[in-house]
Interface confidence: medium
């Protein structure tokens, strides 16, 4: 069995985690994909998932998490905006392929969010309000809440991440519904 590896990302409160999870294009382009958190002693918990089938370039938003599936590029983009210290933890991208077990995309991401002034929306002079708000009408994408922490035998391409500080605050609230909102082909 392949050993699950981790990549560590240390960010400050208010910053954005920008992760790209590569997948095999031909095989998984339209498969439903998800972003999960793995807490000690618990099964992975799905925080957000794409629609089923996954739609090209159309993001799904859950609170401060935005998923965007780029079929042409064979990657799932995950953004967690306006990070909080409580967001610290171990995360992973997975692909649902029922009736089989979810397919995990390596590496897992160890996110460490610390207190700090860098990029906290509203706390720096470059901060401006973003024009985007959560749309009043929503499309809900249903996704399983838990998946079994099964050992994976084949490692697909690893995920890569980019850290950025939002120059403008996206007006996201603590939303529990999954919201489809309009991103490239």
């Amino acid at each position: 069995a392949t050993k699950l590896t981790e990549e560590k990302y240390e960010l400050k409160e208010g910053q954005t985690l920008d992760v790209k999870c590569d997948y095999t294009l031909e095989k998984f382009a339209s498969s439903q994909k998800a972003w999960q958190i793995i807490r000690d002693g618990e099964m992975p918990k799905t925080l957000a998932c794409t629609e089923r089938p996954s739609k090209n370039s159309h993001p799904v938003q859950v609170g401060r998490i935005i998923l965007e599936d780029y079929h042409d590029h064979g990657l799932l983009r995950v953004r967690m905006v306006n990070l909080q210290v409580e967001d610290s933890g171990l995360y992973q991208c997975v692909i649902y392929q029922p009736p089989k077990e979810p397919h995990m995309l390596f590496d897992r991401i160890r996110l460490v969010v610390t207190k700090g002034f860098s990029g906290t929306p509203g706390s720096n002079e470059n901060s401006t309000q973003n024009v985007y708000k959560i749309p009043p009408t929503t499309t809900k994408a249903l996704c399983p809440l838990y998946t079994s922490p099964r050992t994976v035998t084949q490692a697909p391409p690893k995920s890569t991440a980019d850290v950025s500080t939002p120059d403008s605050e996206i007006n996201l609230t603590n939303v529990t519904d999954i919201i489809r909102v309009p991103v490239f082909n």
Partner: antibody, heavy 119, light 107 residues
Framework: QVQLVQSGAEVKKPGSSVKVSCKAS????????ISWVRQAPGQGLEWMGG????????NYAQKFQGRVTITADESTSTAYMELSSLRSEDTAVYYC????????????WGQGTMVTVSS | EIVMTQSPATLSLSPGERATLSCRAS??????LAWYQQKPGQAPRLLIY???NRATGIPARFSGSGSGTDFTLTISSLEPEDFAVYYC?????????FGGGTKVEIK
């Protein structure tokens, strides 16, 4: 406040190429998408293509496929649009525009770059 | 590609009047439609996104409605600075496409 500042006007000969730059200042560059939209004199808006800097891969409208190249340099927060095999009908104002989602609306625009193609 | 058709091409109105601009998509674009205002020599400015949401700093006299294939931009009471060209844009599928524009001119 984020601003997109474009390079100056260009006059080109038919058959040549033009490369227009779009520099973002005052905020994050990588997490956004940058599109290029052109407007011929007295005409409407036409989306040419765009790029998400952290992906590095661009997407193009079919009409411009093979003739346009869109790139981004994260180190300088600058996006570029190069159009080759220019013809007189490419005479237009070329705008760069920022959007949070690739399939999204454009919230911040550059001032525009006039490209004139004339022999 | 999705063809966006705007009507009328020109709207002649007086300040204080109500302006109603129409935009029709050749196929459904859900609610993923934006409206822009453009004045001569200037870049377009985002007014409305996702059919009905006003962008930051846009006055309340501008409102958008519709979903699917038929959309409307309404300016409740025209101000002198509102005379301009207005474009709709769909951002539901690739390629992103714009309507041909509606010019709102002073009567």
């Amino acid at each position: 406040q984020v601003q997109l500042v474009q390079s100056g006007a260009e006059v080109k000969k038919p058959g040549s190429s033009v490369k227009v730059s779009c520099k973002a200042s005052g905020g994050t560059f990588s997490s956004y998408a940058i599109s290029w939209v052109r407007q011929a004199p007295g005409q409407g808006l036409e989306w040419m293509g765009g790029i998400i800097p952290i992906f590095g891969t661009a997407n193009y409208a079919q009409k411009f496929q093979g003739r346009v190249t869109i790139t981004a340099d994260e180190s300088t927060s600058t996006a570029y649009m190069e159009l080759s095999s220019l013809r007189s009908e490419d005479t237009a104002v070329y705008y760069c525009a920022r959007h949070w989602y690739a399939l999204g609306s454009f919230d911040i625009w550059g001032q525009g770059t006039m490209v004139t193609v004339s022999s | 590609e999705i063809v966006m058709t705007q009507s009328p091409a020109t709207l002649s109105l007086s300040p204080g009047e109500r302006a109603t601009l129409s935009c029709r998509a050749s196929q459904s674009v859900s609610s993923y439609l934006a409206w822009y205002q453009q004045k001569p020599g200037q870049a377009p400015r985002l007014l409305i996104y996702d059919s009905s949401n006003r962008a930051t700093g846009i006055p309340a006299r501008f409102s958008g409605s519709g979903s699917g294939t038929d959309f409307t931009l309404t300016i409740s009471s025209l101000e002198p600075e509102d005379f301009a060209v207005y474009y709709c844009q769909q951002h539901d599928v690739w390629p992103i496409t714009f309507g041909g524009g509606t010019k709102v001119e002073i009567k």
